[in-house]
Each structure stands twice: as structure tokens, then as C-alpha cells.
Interface confidence: low
């Protein structure tokens, strides 16, 4: 015998209190699959979280983070504070990268500058807190008449204005 609840589509639940009639999910709840006996409560995006996608009767709300924070964890379960380029987030807030390290993003940790000498190359452009060093050609590559090397302009995220 077929379970009458299997006929209840997404966005409804099988209401045992009403002879297993398919009832619409109440406000602020959803069912993403058919045959559900309950609807799930919608996620609320509040405080540091903001709504990326509203909850509907068939799908949960999706959150992202308010400006100044970025998502961490599956489904943006956490928001972590942004730092400026040239900084990393520690337990005591945003701290400048130590000498010899850099961070070109608003999240993540400071990483050591590239050691050009390991590849037998020279430093063409010194590193900063925000940028890695640019390695130049190895001395052997610098034969007479070789074309000069122009360092690349620092990359910038589209639409990103420095903080």
C-alpha cells in the first residue's frame, strides 16, 4: 500500500493531525523534498549575517556576511572579520605582517616572501607587507643586449579600493 504522504510535494508537509492531508509549510519554514512529515525552520540571517537568498517554501534562506566580514565554514556558518592587505587576523585583532612576510588579501595569513636565490635568481622588486618580491632573471640570463625587464604593476581586485 502506498504511503499517502509520498504524494506531498516539496513546500508542503504531511499533516498527521488532518488525515495526512498535504498542508503548506507555515511561514518561515520550508520542505525541500516531497513526502516530508514536518517543515524545517528557515535560517535567519541577522547581526553580522545578511540575507543572500530569501527563504521560500521549498528552500532554506542563504546568508553571507556584512561588509567588513567574510564567510567561513559550510554554508557560511561563520563570519570572520576582514583585515587590510598587509595584515593578518590574530586573536587580538588585525596585526601587520612581520618583516619578510606579506598578505595581498583581506583574509588569510601572512606568507613569507619568495626566496629568489633558491631558484638562482635575483630580487627585481623588493617585497612589502602587501606584495611578494618579484624575482628577476638569473645572472646567467643577463647576456649583453638582452631586453630589459619591466616589473609588473601590482595586481588589484576588480572594484577594490584600498582601505
Amino acid at each position: 500500500l502506498q504511503d499517502p504522504c509520498s504524494n506531498c510535494p516539496a513546500g508542503t508537509f504531511c499533516d498527521n493531525n488532518r488525515n495526512q492531508i498535504c498542508s503548506p509549510c507555515p511561514p518561515n519554514s520550508f520542505s525541500s523534498a516531497g513526502g516530508q512529515r514536518t517543515c524545517d525552520i528557515c535560517r535567519q540571517c541577522k547581526g553580522v549575517f545578511r540575507t543572500r537568498k530569501e527563504c521560500s517554501s521549498t528552500s532554506n534562506a542563504e546568508c553571507d556576511c556584512t561588509p567588513g566580514f567574510h564567510c567561513l565554514g559550510a554554508g557560511c556558518s561563520m563570519c570572520e572579520q576582514d583585515c587590510k592587505q598587509g595584515q593578518e587576523l590574530t586573536k587580538k585583532g588585525c596585526k601587520d605582517c612581520c618583516f619578510g612576510t606579506f598578505n595581498d588579501q583581506k583574509r588569510g595569513i601572512c606568507r613569507p616572501w619568495t626566496n629568489c636565490s633558491l631558484d638562482g635568481k635575483s630580487v627585481l622588486v623588493n617585497g612589502t607587507k602587501e606584495r611578494d618580491v618579484v624575482c628577476g632573471p638569473s645572472p646567467a640570463d643577463l647576456s649583453p643586449g638582452a631586453s630589459s625587464v619591466t616589473p609588473p604593476a601590482p595586481a588589484r581586485e576588480p572594484g577594490h579600493s584600498p582601505q
Epitope: 547581526g47 553580522v48 567561513l72 556558518s77 561563520m78 563570519c79 572579520q81 587576523l89 586573536k91
Partner: nanobody, 124 residues
């Protein structure tokens, strides 16, 4: 259900003081670091201050250091933010937040539950 309810906001003149409170329920308050954040009109949310579960460690954003003091009363399940020498740029909605994971160590930025906020307006 975890709940955080802020209060104590209002209108205050520049140079004035306010004390914000955050009443917590639904979890073991003393096991969690707590934080205050704020959102000025038209701006992103800014982290303001944090305190470890025991109250032994406190942290402040540079913008409020020396003017704001965070504290907690674990017997009352309440978090406080004492704000002195208030400036126009302190005008914002202030939120309290609970750390996601109970820790005995220092503050982390994994805040999972935020209150509804209380509005502070600094104006003459």
C-alpha cells in the same frame, strides 16, 4: 534556544557616557567568549570589543581603546559595554555576539549568534 537581548542604547551628547547590557540565555554563558560589534548607518559591521569566558582577557578595536570597557557578570548571564567620551562617529547599532565554540582560551572570531541590536546616537 540561544538568545541575546541588548539594551541601554539611546541619545547622548558628545563626551557623554552610556552602558550597554546584553542579557544571554539558552547556553552556559561562562563557557563562551562574547563580543560587541557595531554597524554605523550605511556602513559594514565593525568589531568593537571581546572578552573571554572567564572575563580574564579583553580585547578592543583601536577606535575605542581607552574609551570603552567590556565586562561580564557570569552570575547574571550578562555582558556589558561601558562607553565613555562618546563621539559622533560612535553612532551605530550595537550588537552583542556569542562565540561559536566553548573555549577556555582567548577570543576567536567565530561568532555564531548575534542579538537584534540597540541603537546609540551621539549628537548635540
Amino acid at each position: 534556544e540561544v538568545q541575546l537581548l541588548e539594551s541601554g542604547g539611546g541619545l547622548v551628547q558628545p563626551g557623554g557616557s552610556l552602558r550597554l547590557s546584553c542579557a544571554a540565555s539558552g547556553f552556559t554563558f561562562s563557557s563562551y567568549a562574547m563580543s560587541w560589534g557595531r554597524q554605523a548607518p550605511g556602513k559594514g559591521l565593525e568589531w568593537v570589543s571581546a572578552i573571554s569566558g572567564s572575563g580574564g582577557s579583553t580585547y578592543y578595536a583601536d577606535s575605542v581603546k581607552g574609551r570603552f570597557t567590556i565586562s561580564r557578570d557570569n552570575s547574571k548571564n550578562t555582558l556589558y559595554l561601558h562607553m565613555n567620551s562618546l563621539r559622533a562617529e560612535d553612532t551605530a547599532v550595537y550588537y552583542c555576539a556569542k562565540e561559536k565554540v566553548a573555549t577556555t582560551g582567548d577570543y576567536y572570531y567565530d561568532m555564531d549568534v548575534w542579538g537584534q541590536g540597540t541603537t546609540v546616537t551621539v549628537s548635540s
